[in-house]
């Protein structure tokens, strides 16, 4: 029996539900009755929902999943993943047994967009030119691990005396602190620009230096 | 506004064929399942075929086998019934409808065919 | 083929009564049933999906029941709008049926 999935990841923002594809194709005249279908975790083998015995034995997996009932018996035994974690993320495998037998695995990417970048300066006031400042780029609850970048005003790259540390919360959701250590010249504008991978997203802070005051665009 | 219409109904001999259309919009066709329903004057609803979302499984109610074909266009939006042999008990009104997963959820109007010499 | 068997094939009541229909299949279907109601000239609105669950934008005044070969619609206290005729409809087998419709009409 050929089970199908999608090769490429599912992508599923956290909170939102996500769908994991599967299906086969059933015989004319295929009733429910004659299907027993298991998703599992790939990796464990952790049950996650299942269909027995012409019925919907339901979600073992912290009641967050659904099957499709209209559409399983034309062959889709794709499963609904409700309000998805960061800890959702990796393979499903699921398993269709008919009169033959057929499994495929599906994976699941789980994303979450990193919130502007909010910027402090260290020291804040009576700078000049030549002084040292610490620039500090602060983004939060993104998914997976940002990628991040500085540039001066002229989108020069700025890469040396950048460090950067990124702390997972709770929910698995990453914090992101980069600080970049610059001397002042006359006029200065530096940017942040925090990237999602998975996403292609990115989100962009800068501060502009000009003497006095300071001015956080 | 999530929307479906029918077309292509009208007059056709015995033995004859016609094609309908059902222009799908304000949702995303290509990901949904379809489904044709027909309705003969003071009938009841009669399930004609269905449709997975991209065309290549397709299943019908024994008596349209080999007479009927449905079939999609994504990149147009459009579910299509072709209807060959009509005879004059194929008269009735011919409904597309959405598979939600959990129901048939939006209809069409309804596009009638009449089957008669 | 999944038969299913509607009854009473007429009921008539008056607006303020309560309404009970029943769908019955000639093989255990669990509750892939869903029902519709149909008013003349228009086409088919979903009710009830799951045999139990209400569609988005139904009244409470619908509730579905059942599960196996029996399932039951009832509407609680009959408004105007609601006389029409209902289908039951199974997707428990790759061939879809409907129930032949109960009209309800006010009496």
């Known amino acids: 029996l050929e089970v199908q999935v999608p090769e490429d990841p599912v992508v599923a923002l956290v909170g939102t539900d996500a769908t994991l594809c599967c299906s086969f194709s059933p015989e004319p005249g295929f009733s429910l009755a004659q299907l027993n279908l298991i998703w599992q975790l790939t990796d464990t083998k952790q049950l996650v929902h299942s269909f027995a015995e012409g019925q919907d034995q339901g979600s073992a997996y912290a009641n967050r999943t659904a099957l499709f009932p209209d559409l399983l018996a034309q062959g889709n035994a794709s499963l609904r993943l409700q309000r998805v974690r960061v800890a959702d993320e990796g393979s499903f495998t699921c398993f269709v047994s008919i009169r033959d037998f057929g499994s495929a695995a599906v994976s699941l990417q789980v994303a979450a967009p990193y919130s502007k970048p909010s910027m402090t300066l260290e020291p804040n006031k009576d700078l000049r030119p030549g002084d040292t400042v610490t620039i500090t780029c602060s983004s939060y609850r993104g998914y997976p691990e940002a990628e991040v970048f500085w540039q001066d005003g002229q989108g020069v790259p700025l890469t040396g005396n950048v460090t950067t540390s990124q702390m997972a919360n709770e929910q698995g959701l990453f914090d992101v602190h980069s600080v970049l250590r610059v001397v002042l010249g006359a006029n200065g504008t530096y940017s942040c620009l925090v990237r999602n991978p998975v996403l292609q997203q990115d989100a962009h802070g800068s501060v502009t230096i000009t003497g006095q005051p300071m001015t956080f665009p | 506004e999530v929307q479906l219409l029918e077309s292509g109904g009208g007059l056709v001999q015995p033995g004859g064929s016609l094609r309908l259309s059902c222009a799908a919009s304000g949702f995303t066709f290509s990901a949904y399942y379809m489904i044709w329903v027909r309705q003969a004057p003071g009938k009841g609803l009669e399930w004609v075929s269905i449709?997975?979302?991209?065309?290549?499984?397709?299943s019908y109610a024994q008596k349209f086998q080999g007479r009927f074909t449905i079939s999609r266009d994504n990149s147009k939006n459009t579910l299509y019934l072709q209807m060959n042999s009509l005879r004059a008990e194929d008269t009735a009104v011919y409904y597309c409808?959405?598979?939600?997963?959990?129901?048939?959820?939006?209809w069409g109007q309804g596009t009638l065919v009449t089957v008669s010499s | 083929e999944i038969v299913l068997t509607q009854s009473p094939g007429t009921l008539s009541l008056s607006p303020g009564e309560r309404a009970t229909l029943s769908c019955h299949a000639s093989?255990?279907?669990?509750?892939?049933v869903a029902w519709y109601q149909q008013k003349p000239g228009q086409a088919p609105r979903l009710l009830i999906y799951?045999?139990?669950n209400r569609a988005t934008g139904i009244p409470d005044r619908f509730s579905g029941s059942g599960s196996g070969t029996d399932f039951t619609l009832t509407i609680s206290h009959l408004e105007p709008e609601d006389f029409a005729v209902y289908y039951c409809?199974?997707?428990?087998?790759?061939?879809?049926?409907f129930g032949q419709g109960t009209k309800v009409e006010i009496k």
């Open positions: 799951d045999a139990s």
């Open positions: 409809q199974q997707s428990y087998s790759t061939l879809l049926t």
């Open positions: 409808a959405r598979v939600g997963g959990r129901g048939f959820d939006i």
């Open positions: 093989q255990g279907i669990s509750n892939y």
């Open positions: 449709t997975n979302p991209s065309g290549g499984v397709t």
